[in-house]
Structures are given as structure tokens and as C-alpha cells.
């Protein structure tokens, strides 16, 4: 089904957003304290593998940073440890818990050099800047058709109230640097560029700082020119995944195409023990196939209750009248051996189709792969 232009989907670094987690916890620690964050499994069920993330970046365990599936400890905390922390499911990147951590120490008398911050002090504990909605800060890539308008936002808080400045490709960015200028709204923590052109492509960084610390976020802007081109698949998506037997897996594939693309999820399969046909082209089966009416489509393939036979190589393929783009990726399924399971059947959402998929001829798709139906696959599995 097409997404339509009402929905604009953008690159979220392999994240599948789950249901909105509960209220973000605001935690304040003193300098030198041990920061301890706890994230019990929702509903008391099994947790599965998790990853801890700070300001959008995965935390690497060290002597000071102790990472467990349900608990994170940061020893001897300093101002640099302030920020937005989240615990996520490793496979789906779903946010299970998130915390806003501020590490403070009471400023000594005479600490204010210019006195200007005193007026801003709210009486709340002083602290370094932090993102007010960290779960909205994960998206990094914005691809926009030329002549449209772009807005980057970095809403933050801190005490004293932080300032915000903007860089383009690592250098100070001011209005005179682009035709048409820029519009800044400090109270909205935003930068607006109207009627973007290809020369606006680049990396845009917001730097939010006060005297206790600084945080930054970098966005990549791509400006799509309206000359017809074959579909573009976002770099890095979909990504290889490892799944536990019986778990659910979701893959993203981000497609940009001015001309309506035919989008497919395919899986490499074996027929009579062979992965390729007599002419050397790989066998693939169509899992999902549709025409997208959207210039941008964030397409997803959901595999429920995966078994070992779901492991293997998958393809996201987008075809328009100009050409084909495709991305291959792997799913590895591991865990205790379960009884042989039948192929995953289509769920109500129609994530995986079996048997009744209309197949497109090799000529239509450039003849790169042999297409076989799930019925054929059943046949070959059982013979």
C-alpha cells in the first residue's frame, strides 16, 4: 500500500519505534557519584538482548561504564556523562526505557564570570544541556526535493538555559552563506532554509551549550533534483540482523524515487539443493510486492516467530522505468533448536505473503533473479 504524501518518512538509524515508552525519567546525580539506571523488562516478561544508548550512540562497556541487560552503571560521573540515555531491544531498537541524566556540582562562589547566567538560573539544580525529547533525535538523514523548505530542530533544556548555534560541514553557518538566507528561531531551537537547492547538501550540526556542558546533533541533508533517476536506497538500510529463535524481526528499507517505484522484498532460496538456476541466476521468492505512489517510502518487512529456515539472504528491490536499485542483507537465526516449523504465513497485517503472490517476469525486472512462488517453495521443501 502506498504511503501517500501525507506521511513523510525519514532515515532513522535502523530503529523500529515501538509504542511510546512511559514518561522519561529526569535524574540528577552529583559529580563523582555512580549513575545507576535500571530498566526492568516490560510486564516482567523476558527481556531479550538489549543495548544501552547515550545521545543516540551505543555505550561501550569499560572499567567505568558497566553495562548489563537491565542495568547501567557509570562510575565516577562527570558533567560529560549528562545526556539522554535509553535502553533498547538489540534486535528491533525499540526503546524500552529512557532517562534524562544531569550530573551537577554546586557552583562555588564567584563561579559566574560575567554574571549573565544568574538571571536565567531558575533555582533548580544547575546542569548541562540535555535533549528534551531524545526519542525524536534519532533521525539523522533528510532527503528533500529541491525548492522545498527544510527545518532542523534541536529542542533542549538545561540550567542556565543553553544557547544554540549551527554549523554546516563543521563550520559556523550564517545566513549570508546561502542565497535566500536562513531563519533562526532560538526559542524553537530551529533552523529553517527555504527553497533548498543542491548546494545546500551537507551536514548540519546544532551545538547546544551552557557553562556546564555541551551537546550536539548532526543531520545530513540531501537535496533531490527533479531529473528522473533510478530509485535510491538509503545507505545502511536495511542492516544485517541476528535473531533469537521464535522472536520477531523487522527490516527497514528506505526508497526514494520520483517515478513510481515497484518495491519488492525478496528472499534467496534453494531449489532442489541449488541456489542458482541452470543459467547461473539466483533463485528468489517474492515475499512482498507493491507499487508505491510516494516519492519517499519507508518499507518494512516483518517476520514473526522466526525459525532457522528464515535465516538467509534477503533483498529489498525498487524498480522504476529508469532502472533498478537493490540492497542485500542477512538474517541469522540462532538459539535452541525448535521443532521443524512451517513457513511463516501471512499475518493480518500482510507482512509476509505466501503462495498467491503475482510474479513479475524476468524481463520486467531485468532478469537478474529467478522468481519462484511460495507454493513452489513448499513443494521443494517437502520433496
Amino acid at each position: 500500500e502506498s504511503l501517500g504524501t501525507e506521511q513523510r518518512v525519514v532515515g532513522r538509524a535502523a530503529e523500529v519505534p515501538g509504542p511510546e515508552p512511559g514518561q522519561q525519567e529526569q535524574l540528577v546525580f552529583g559529580s563523582g557519584d555512580a549513575v545507576e539506571l535500571s530498566c526492568p523488562p516490560p510486564g516482567g516478561g523476558p527481556m531479550g538482548p538489549t543495548v544501552w544508548v547515550k545521545d543516540g550512540t551505543g555505550l561501550v562497556p569499560s572499567e567505568r561504564v558497566l553495562v548489563g541487560p537491565q542495568r547501567l552503571q557509570v562510575l565516577n560521573a562527570s558533567h560529560e556523562d549528562s545526556g539522554a540515555y535509553s535502553c533498547r531491544q538489540r534486535l528491533t531498537q525499540r526503546v524500552l526505557c529512557h532517562f534524562s541524566v544531569r550530573v551537577t556540582d554546586a557552583p562555588s562562589s564567584g563561579d559566574d564570570e560575567d554574571g549573565e547566567d544568574e538571571a536565567e538560573d531558575t533555582g533548580v539544580d544547575t546542569g548541562a544541556p540535555y535533549w528534551t525529547r531524545p526519542e525524536r533525535m534519532d533521525k539523522k538523514l533528510l532527503a528533500v526535493p529541491a525548492a522545498n523548505t527544510v527545518r532542523f530542530r534541536c529542542p533542549a533544556a538545561g540550567n542556565p538555559t543553553p544557547s544554540i548555534s549551527w554549523l554546516k560541514n563543521g563550520r559556523e553557518f550564517r545566513g549570508e552563506h546561502r542565497i535566500g538566507g536562513i531563519k533562526l528561531r532560538h526559542q524553537q531551537w530551529s533552523l529553517v532554509m527555504e527553497s533548498v537547492v543542491p548546494s545546500d547538501r551537507g551536514n548540519y550540526t546544532c551545538v547546544v551549550e551552557n557553562k556546564f556542558g555541551s551537546i550536539r546533533q548532526t543531520y545530513t541533508l540531501d537535496v533531490l533534483e527533479r531529473s528522473p533517476h533510478r530509485p535510491i536506497l538509503q545507505a545502511g538500510l536495511p542492516a544485517n540482523q541476528t535473531a533469537v529463535l521464535g522472536s520477531d524481526v523487522e527490516f527497514h528499507c528506505k526508497v526514494y524515487s520520483d517515478a513510481q517505484p515497484h518495491i519488492q522484498w525478496l528472499k534467496h532460496v534453494e531449489v532442489n539443493g541449488s541456489k542458482v538456476g541452470p543459467d547461473g541466476t539466483p533463485y528468489v521468492t517474492v515475499l512482498k510486492s507493491w507499487i508505491s505512489e510516494s516519492v519517499e517510502a519507508d518499507v518494512r518487512l516483518r517476520l514473526a516467530n522466526v525459525s532457522e529456515r528464515d535465516g538467509g539472504e534477503y533483498l529489498c528491490r525498487a524498480t522504476n522505468f529508469i532502472g533498478v536499485a537493490e540492497k542485500a542483507f542477512w538474517l541469522s537465526v540462532h538459539g535452541p533448536r525448535a521443532a521443524e516449523e512451517e513457513l511463516v504465513e501471512a499475518d493480518e497485517a500482510g507482512s509476509v505473503y505466501a503462495g498467491e503472490q503475482k510474479l513479475i517476469s524476468e524481463e520486467d525486472l531485468g532478469g537478474e533473479q529467478k522468481l519462484i512462488s511460495e507454493e513452489d517453495l513448499h513443494h521443494h521443501h517437502h520433496h
Epitope: 513523510r8 533525535m137 533528510l142 526535493p145 522545498n148 527533479r226
Partner: antibody
Framework: EVQLVESGGGLVQPGGSLRLSCAAS????????ISWVRQAPGKGLEWVGR????????NYADSVKGRFTISADTSKNTAYLQMNSLRAEDTAVYYC????????????????????WGQGTLVTVSS | DIQMTQSPSSLSASVGDRVTITCRAS??????LAWYKQKPGKAPKLLIY???FLYSGVPSRFSGSGSGTDFTLTISSLQPEDFATYYC?????????FGQGTKVEIK
């Protein structure tokens, strides 16, 4: 200079059809969208639908879905509003407007802004 | 659909007056709100987009503010050419919806 000129309005009987045209000039037609907005006599504005000419992607208001079709001919820099099964309540001045998007990673939608409008063409549905 | 309610429906003012029009959305529309001005028999003209950004070429006496559900259009010093009907419009949700309009008349 950006210009949008609507044509094709007139009197039509209930159940009849009409095709409106919107000729665009002064900007790159394929870079932005074209929206149709209507205004019944003495009433406010009502959004009808939108097309992005390069992709052919369209959206419609529920009140016209299935009866109205928006299309575009990029070689002629012209958008069209095909109106079928017309009703008395479709009587209005129909405007086309250049439409651009405000793209913002922080939110899950695109804000659409109509910055240049045509002069409008009157459609009267009456027996 | 998201309902947009403007108030007042009409107002009388004099040249030089400060005029404020409000627009309330039935649900949160963030800052996705535009203001348009329309004179009788003419097409609407864009004044403000994204709640507070002045469209190019629009006089600085016009300003917009607000976010979420409550928005304001302010004309700091009313000029003769400002007597018109003003519409707010949201586009976070489908379909885009307009307020019913506020008519600004000469006192």
C-alpha cells in the same frame, strides 16, 4: 514571475462532469506540488486535494474522493482537476495553488504550504 | 478531521490599531499552522507559515505565534490594505483544514 491560471469552470448539471486546468509558469513545475482549494459562495476555504507532478502522487479530501481526480502533464506545466458525479454542494470558486513541503526530521509529517494561488474559476452545479 | 476554530468571526478596527486574531485546533498540530489573507473576489495570499515564520514579501507588521492548539495572528498597526478576511490552516493531519475565517472591517 510565478503565475497560475485556472480555466474550465462553468455551469453543469448535477451528475455531470467538468475538467479544470491550472497552467503554471515562472517556476519549476516538477519541483513542488499543486493543490486545489475551493470556496463556496459566501463561505470559507476547503482543501480539495494535491498532486506532486513528478511522481503523480495524489491526496484527496474525503468529500471528493472517488469523484474527483487530480492529474498533471509535466510537458505542458499544467495540472488538472477532473470532476465527475457533480453535486449542488460542489458549487464553488476553485483555486489551484503552488504547494511546497516543510520537511522536518523532528516530526512525522510534512507541513504543506500554498504560497502562490491562481485567480480561481467558478463552477456552478445546478439543474 | 482536525477542526480549526477562529475567533472572533469578525471585528471592527481603525487604521493604526493593533489587531489580534486567534485560532484553536481541536488537537495538537505542533507548529504546522499557516495564515492567509483574502480580499473579496481575490485569491488568498500566504502571510505566515509554521506558526511564526513570515513569508517573503509580507510586511513585518504581521506576526504569528503559538504551538500545539493555540495560535495568534497579530497585526501591529492596521493599514487600509489589511481590511480583509483571514484564515488559519493546519497541515499536520489529513486532510488539511482551514478555520472559518475572521473578517476585519473598518470601524
Amino acid at each position: 514571475e510565478v503565475q497560475l491560471v485556472e480555466s474550465g469552470g462553468g455551469l453543469v448539471q448535477p451528475g455531470g462532469s467538468l475538467r479544470l486546468s491550472c497552467a503554471a509558469s515562472g517556476f519549476t513545475f516538477t519541483s513542488t506540488g499543486i493543490s486545489w482549494v475551493r470556496q463556496a459562495p459566501g463561505k470559507g476555504l476547503e482543501w480539495v486535494g494535491r498532486i506532486y507532478p513528478t511522481s503523480g502522487s495524489t491526496n484527496y479530501a474525503d468529500s471528493v474522493k472517488g469523484r474527483f481526480t487530480i492529474s498533471a502533464d509535466t510537458s505542458k506545466n499544467t495540472a488538472y482537476l477532473q470532476m465527475n458525479s457533480l453535486r449542488a454542494e460542489d458549487t464553488a470558486v476553485y483555486y489551484c495553488a503552488r504547494t511546497y513541503g516543510i520537511y522536518d526530521l523532528y516530526v512525522d509529517y510534512t507541513e504543506y504550504v500554498m504560497d502562490y494561488w491562481g485567480q480561481g474559476t467558478l463552477v456552478t452545479v445546478s439543474s | 478531521d482536525i477542526q480549526m476554530t477562529q475567533s472572533p468571526s469578525s471585528l471592527s478596527a481603525s487604521v493604526g490599531d493593533r489587531v489580534t486574531i486567534t485560532c484553536r485546533a481541536s488537537q495538537d498540530v505542533d507548529t504546522s499552522l499557516a495564515w492567509y489573507k483574502q480580499k473579496p473576489g481575490k485569491a488568498p495570499k500566504l502571510l505566515i507559515y509554521s506558526a511564526s515564520f513570515l513569508y517573503s514579501g509580507v510586511p513585518s507588521r504581521f506576526s504569528g505565534s503559538g504551538s500545539g492548539t493555540d495560535f495568534t495572528l497579530t497585526i501591529s498597526s492596521l493599514q487600509p490594505e489589511d481590511f480583509a478576511t483571514y484564515y488559519c490552516q493546519q497541515s499536520t493531519g489529513h486532510p488539511q483544514t482551514f478555520g472559518q475565517g475572521t473578517k476585519v472591517e473598518i470601524k
